[in-house]
């Protein structure tokens, strides 16, 4: 028995930051589990992972350097990430594995989604121009 | 005027327990990450835990993850760190610092830090 | 884990003279850099956040520079209630980092 994830086909990180929701068809509530994002086709990047053990505080880290938060709801945890770089524009899965109470149970393949990281404008906009560079 | 006062260090043996406090005042507590970074004796500043604005997250250091936790009570606008397994290394100043909540990691204000001595 | 080298570790001045001091990151930060004073006894104090800009109520006098992997802090003319401790951090990548610190020493 698998747990089936929802995520958004694409979203675009502006600021460089983005929230991605991974929504799941099972309640988390009172549950040990570790939810993670995993970048790449391959999911070969462990991008962040929230655990959490019925405690009401969530446990949050990257082994990877990513900068990451995350809140959970009853059926799914959302990813908060920052300082994203233009070339990180990847594909972003989402995993779920519940430890506690038995069965272990993990997810089926999500489809992911497509982050594209747009860059922070530094030209001056044309309304407002800045300082000219010599 | 922003004030952070920690509280509760001192000489434990290796292997101990601590409970640091941090009051703040100043300022509207429960709109801040707050974090706990250390200084051991004449080395440089390291960061050990955070907890978000609402207590629902926090992330730890690799060398404390599994000895140290972080929480907070913004009714009392106190922060707080558990430090358990305590070892001859954690021996440093701790200070606890605010950071916005849009910034995460940037720590505007300090506390004036509390000294956690680890020895037999 | 990101790590900042600082360089010099001493550098010793006397009053108005230009403190020049540099934090090298192991890989680009972007301008999440920022600069911290601190001094015997005391909490460190937040002087410049993301690379160049100063934070409330910091003297004209420091300014900091750079993107990428190379920051600098300088203080233009050094006062007698400047000489401390410089510390950089990134707020980058997680977790977040210190450098070792640059004393700032009167000659």
């Known amino acids: 028995n698998k747990i089936l994830v929802k995520q958004s086909p694409m979203l675009v990180a502006y600021d460089n930051a983005v929230n991605l929701s991974c929504k799941y068809s099972y309640n988390l509530f009172s549950r040990e589990f570790r939810a993670s994002l995993h970048k790449g086709l391959d999911s070969a990047v462990e991008v962040c992972v929230v655990y959490g053990n019925y405690s009401q505080q969530l446990q949050v880290y990257s082994k990877t350097g990513f900068n990451c938060d995350g809140k959970l709801g009853n059926e799914s945890v959302t990813f908060y990430l920052q300082n994203l770089y233009v070339n990180q524009t990847d594909i972003y899965f989402c995993k779920i594995e519940v430890m506690y109470p038995p069965p272990y149970l993990d997810n089926e393949k999500s489809n992911g989604t497509i982050i594209h990281v747009k860059g922070k404008h530094l030209c001056p906009s044309p309304l407002f121009p800045g300082p000219s560079k010599p | 005027e922003v004030q952070l006062v920690e509280s509760g260090g001192g000489l434990v043996q290796p292997g101990g327990s601590l409970r640091l406090s941090c009051a703040a005042s100043?300022?509207?507590?429960?709109?801040?990450?707050m974090h706990w970074v250390r200084q051991p004796p004449g080395k440089g500043l390291m960061w050990v835990s955070r907890?978000?604005?609402?207590?629902?997250?926090?992330s730890h250091a690799d060398s404390v993850r599994d000895r140290f936790s972080i929480s907070r009570d913004n009714a009392k606008n106190t922060l707080y760190l558990q430090l358990n397994g305590l070892r001859a290394e954690d021996t440093a100043v701790y200070y606890c610092a605010r950071a916005d909540s849009t910034t995460w990691y940037e720590f505007d204000f300090w506390g004036q830090g509390a000294l956690v001595t680890v020895s037999s | 884990e990101i790590v900042l080298t600082q360089s010099p570790a001493t550098l010793s001045l006397s009053p108005g003279e230009r403190a020049t001091l540099s934090c090298r990151a192991s890989q680009s930060i972007s301008i999440y850099l920022a600069w911290y004073q601190q001094k015997p006894g005391q909490a460190p104090r937040l002087l410049i956040f993301d690379a160049s800009k100063r934070a409330t109520g910091i003297p004209a006098r420091f300014s900091g520079s750079g993107s990428g992997t190379d920051f600098t802090l300088t203080i233009s003319s050094l006062e007698p209630e400047d000489f401390a401790v410089y510390s950089c951090q990134q707020r980058h990548n997680w977790p977040p980092t210190f450098g070792q610190g640059t004393k700032v020493e009167i000659k």
């Open positions: 907890i978000n604005s609402d207590g629902s997250t926090a």
């Open positions: 100043g300022f509207t507590f429960s709109d801040y990450w």
